[in-house]
């Protein structure tokens, strides 16, 4: 039975040209995390595998950095980066947990972080 929950940074906003950290955290389970995927809509941005380490998609290499931790840092943001991001936790023995983050990239300098929320 899957008992875990994913806590994410929720709905967040950031300034064009700036950077943002996407973070998810898996809690309420003793399952072992074997791999975390970061996806933007249907595009795979990066994978962190427990055995093999990080692999960033070459298409995003110049604007995506691994970490901190199992998170992902997006740099040199553009308005095209606005949208949904997903952290997909592969675990043993539970299976797969998915968290969602919505990022809005703003032209102005009044970008603020949204509230944190949980996805069961």
């Amino acid at each position: 039975m899957m008992t875990g929950t994913i806590e994410t940074t929720g709905n967040i906003s950031a300034e064009k040209g700036g950077s943002i950290i996407l973070q998810c955290h898996l809690s309420s389970t003793t399952a072992q995390v074997t791999q975390v995927n970061w996806e933007q809509q249907d595009q795979l941005l990066a994978i962190c595998n427990a055995d093999l380490g990080w692999h960033i998609s070459p298409s995003f290499k110049d604007r995506v950095a691994p970490g901190p931790g199992l998170g992902l840092t997006l740099q040199s943001l553009t308005v095209n980066d606005t949208g949904e991001y997903f952290c997909i936790y592969h675990t043993y023995p539970d299976g797969t947990y998915t968290g969602r983050i919505f990022l809005e990239v703003l032209e102005s300098s009044v970008a603020e972080h949204g509230a944190r929320f949980q996805i069961p």
Partner: antibody, heavy 117, light 107 residues
Framework: EVQLQESGPGLVKPSETLSLTCAAS?????????WHWIRQPPGKKLEWMGF???????VYNPSLKGRITISHDTSKNQFSLKLSSVTAADTAVYFC??????????WGQGTTVTVSS | DIQMTQSPSSLSASVGDRVTITCRTS??????LAWYQQKPGKVPKLLIY???TLAEGVPSRFSGSGSGTDFTLTISSLQPEDVATYYC?????????FGQGTKLEIK
């Protein structure tokens, strides 16, 4: 078009070190992807050996740990394999390959290495 | 290590036949399975990755399916140029491992 080409001695004596180089053309090995070595003993299945990232960090097959070293020379756009203390069991066709999320989308032509005295 | 078991080890089929090769893994690899085609005396060629995504330039008669521990490569209508050995490979952990291969021949 990305191309990989292996080179190195075709004959190595037992207990010595096997050294191979893979030259990449059409793509910079520092521009993403991982760079792998895979081998295939005569009549047998493929065996993954290890890889080097564009950053220079490495991951090896635990079965070869202590014997294998993969390095790169970014100025020549090539990466290399060293395998020490070889035996007849290391006789194989050795392939270099480009890795994307740990599958292999571009392969070299392969080079045959025989371990014999 | 994740063990990869392919079946059958060899098979013979006629041009136009539907051909199925299976790959079973010793533990859950989710969808992280690739298939390669190696023609006699040639280099392996990537056919499919992530279980079902066709690599660039691969004919649509090739398809992949499965998840977890059981996976299938299907050739919908066998062509003479499909004579080769086919390997599965997981791309999920260290060490990356291949199946022992399935040798496909034309009747």
């Amino acid at each position: 078009e990305v191309q990989l080409q292996e080179s190195g001695p075709g004959l190595v004596k037992p207990s010595e070190t096997l050294s191979l180089t893979c030259a990449a053309s059409g793509y910079s090995i520092t521009s993403g992807y991982d760079w792998h070595w895979i081998r295939q003993p005569p009549g047998k299945k493929l065996e993954w050996m290890g890889f080097i990232r564009d950053s220079g960090s490495t991951v090896y097959n635990p079965s070869l740990k202590g014997r294998i070293t993969i390095s790169h020379d970014t100025s020549k756009n090539q990466f290399s394999l060293k395998l020490s203390s070889v035996t007849a069991a290391d006789t194989a066709v050795y392939f270099c390959a480009r890795g994307l999320f740990w599958y292999f989308d571009v392969w070299g032509q392969g080079t045959t290495v025989t371990v014999s005295s | 290590d994740i063990q990869m078991t392919q079946s059958p080890s060899s098979l013979s089929a006629s041009v136009g036949d539907r051909v199925t090769i299976t790959c079973r893994t010793s533990e859950n690899i989710f969808s992280y399975l690739a298939w390669y085609q190696q023609k006699p005396g040639k280099v392996p060629k990537l056919l499919i990755y992530n279980t079902k995504t066709l690599a660039e330039g691969v004919p649509s008669r090739f398809s992949g399916s499965g998840s977890g521990t059981d996976f299938t490569l299907t050739i919908s209508s066998l062509q003479p140029e499909d004579v080769a050995t086919y390997y599965c490979q997981h791309h999920y952990g260290n060490p990356l491992t291949f199946g022992q291969g399935t040798k496909l021949e034309i009747k």
